[in-house]
């Protein structure tokens, strides 16, 4: 979390922004809140990024003012505006891509004074993983696949019963590029289970961490997955 | 050549669900945001709703929020439309759009368009 | 919502003159603004984009303009095929959305 002030103290606001993580490929939000005030149009929000010279997104006067908006960000920004008056003034990112990664300034002018926060947005690729039983394999094998990851993960396989177990030797991890060439799918196959058992697929880079669960008993097979983001810091 | 092949269209009583799909090729499918637009019979354009290119994310029209579903196959090249609740002001010719690459928000590819028609 | 509204609704002009249409948006929308034309029974087809940006395998005489709320499309020496019915798009936002269109008729 990152509170910012605004420069004189007597006309300075409180400014909020959250760290956050973006999907390549996929529309990301860019936290930021700030002390609201009563009327719309003396609002402005603009949105910096350190390094590129034009806005990323300005918001003034009830409505988005786009004149000085960065050609890399054509078409992509667009702020909640029915929540600006309630001190909302988050970005919505469409399509996220790799190059958007880097240092953002959420800059807020109100009738109460100025403020503004930085916020570290790193983008990458996630996605949840899916555990199967490989029925095409020699032994009781299990496959985990999720289709979209970057920077390339680490994949740990874990058991209910043999906790602690390294699973390494009897475990094949392989990575394949998309046809983005950036993301990549990850597969990793882990040999010799045994039934009765819960198996965890761990996939972990330094943007996000998913984990696909499976228990196979005679009767059933029961799945479970989740995905949490690592770097959700408030500033 | 790329091409959108729209299908799913028909006639559907009021409160009818139907599901739209729209079977892609000639292009990397899931590099590109998709959308559908339609058109009501001698309307203009309406956009209805969009999905990233992973799937992950979508964005609806005011007009069928939370009754459309919009959804991608990226394994099947197939993009869908899950429609609810229809209604007779949904009846129009519902066409598949490919949304430029670099940048977003305007329709390089159209399919041909499926026809719904909502009516008792 | 940014609502476009495109003028006149019908133009009716001879093969060989020049036609201007015109998209008028409600709030400023820079120069996120493309054109479509649209024959009978067909799909749309892009022209234009970010306004006055060509596509390639659109002839030449198609141009575009303007920025801010006014954006005009120009065909410099009409064609037969060019009768069709002509939509701008707004482009700017999540929501997106089409002019009224402009119907251009043989006189």
């Known amino acids: 979390l990152i509170i910012g002030f605004g420069i004189s103290g007597r006309h300075s606001i409180t400014v909020t922004t959250v760290a956050s993580a973006g999907n390549i490929g996929e529309d990301g939000i860019l936290s930021c809140t700030f002390e609201p005030d009563i009327k719309l149009s003396d609002i402005v929000i603009q949105w910096l990024k350190e390094g590129v010279l034009g806005l990323v997104h300005e918001f003034k006067e009830g409505k988005d003012e786009l004149s000085e908006q960065d050609e890399m960000f054509r078409g992509r920004t667009a702020v909640f505006a029915d929540q600006v008056i309630v001190g909302n003034a988050s970005l919505r990112l469409k399509n996220v891509q790799l190059t958007d990664a880097g240092t953002y300034k959420c800059y807020i002018i109100t009738s109460k004074g100025k403020g503004n926060a930085n916020l570290e947005y790193k983008t990458g690729a996630f996605s949840m993983p899916e555990v199967n039983v490989d029925y095409n394999a020699s032994s009781e094998t299990l496959r985990c696949e999720a289709p979209r990851w970057f920077p390339q993960p680490t994949v740990v396989w874990a058991s209910q019963v043999d906790q602690g177990a390294n699973f390494s030797e009897v475990s094949n991890t392989s990575f394949e590029l998309n046809s983005e060439n950036v993301t990549m799918k990850v597969v990793s196959v882990l040999y010799n289970v045994t039934i009765n058992n819960t198996y965890s697929c761990m996939i972990e880079n330094d943007i996000a961490k998913a984990t696909g669960d499976i228990k196979v008993t005679e009767s059933e097979i029961k799945r479970r997955s989740h995905l949490q983001l690592l770097n959700s810091k408030a500033s | 050549e790329v091409q959108l092949v729209e299908s799913g269209g028909g006639l559907v009583q009021p409160g009818g669900s139907l599901r739209l799909s729209c079977a892609a090729s000639?292009?990397?499918?899931?590099?590109?945001?998709m959308s559908w637009v339609r058109q009501a019979p001698g309307k203009g354009l309406e956009w209805v709703a969009y999905v990233s290119s992973g799937g992950g994310s979508t964005y609806y029209s005011d007009s069928v929020k939370g009754r459309f579903t919009i959804s991608r196959d990226n394994a099947k090249n197939t993009l869908y439309l899950q429609m609810s609740s229809l209604r007779a002001e949904d009846t129009a010719v519902y066409y598949c759009a490919r949304e430029s690459y670099s940048q977003g928000n305007y329709f390089d590819y159209w399919g041909q368009g499926t026809t719904v028609t909502v009516s008792s | 919502e940014i609502v476009l509204t495109q003028s006149p609704a019908t133009l009716s002009l001879s093969p060989g003159e020049r036609a201007t249409l015109s998209c008028r948006a409600s709030q400023s929308i820079s120069d996120y603004l493309h054109w479509y034309q649209q024959k009978p029974g067909q799909a749309p087809r892009l022209l234009i984009y970010?306004?006055?940006q060509s596509i390639s395998g659109i002839p030449a005489r198609f141009s575009g303009s303007g920025s801010g709320t006014d954006f005009t499309l120009t065909i410099s020496s009409l064609e037969p095929e060019d009768f069709a019915v002509y939509y701008c798009q707004n482009g700017h936002s999540f929501s997106l959305t089409f002019g009224q269109g402009t119907k251009l008729e043989i006189k």
């Open positions: 970010f306004a006055s």
């Open positions: 000639g292009f990397t499918f899931s590099n590109y945001y």
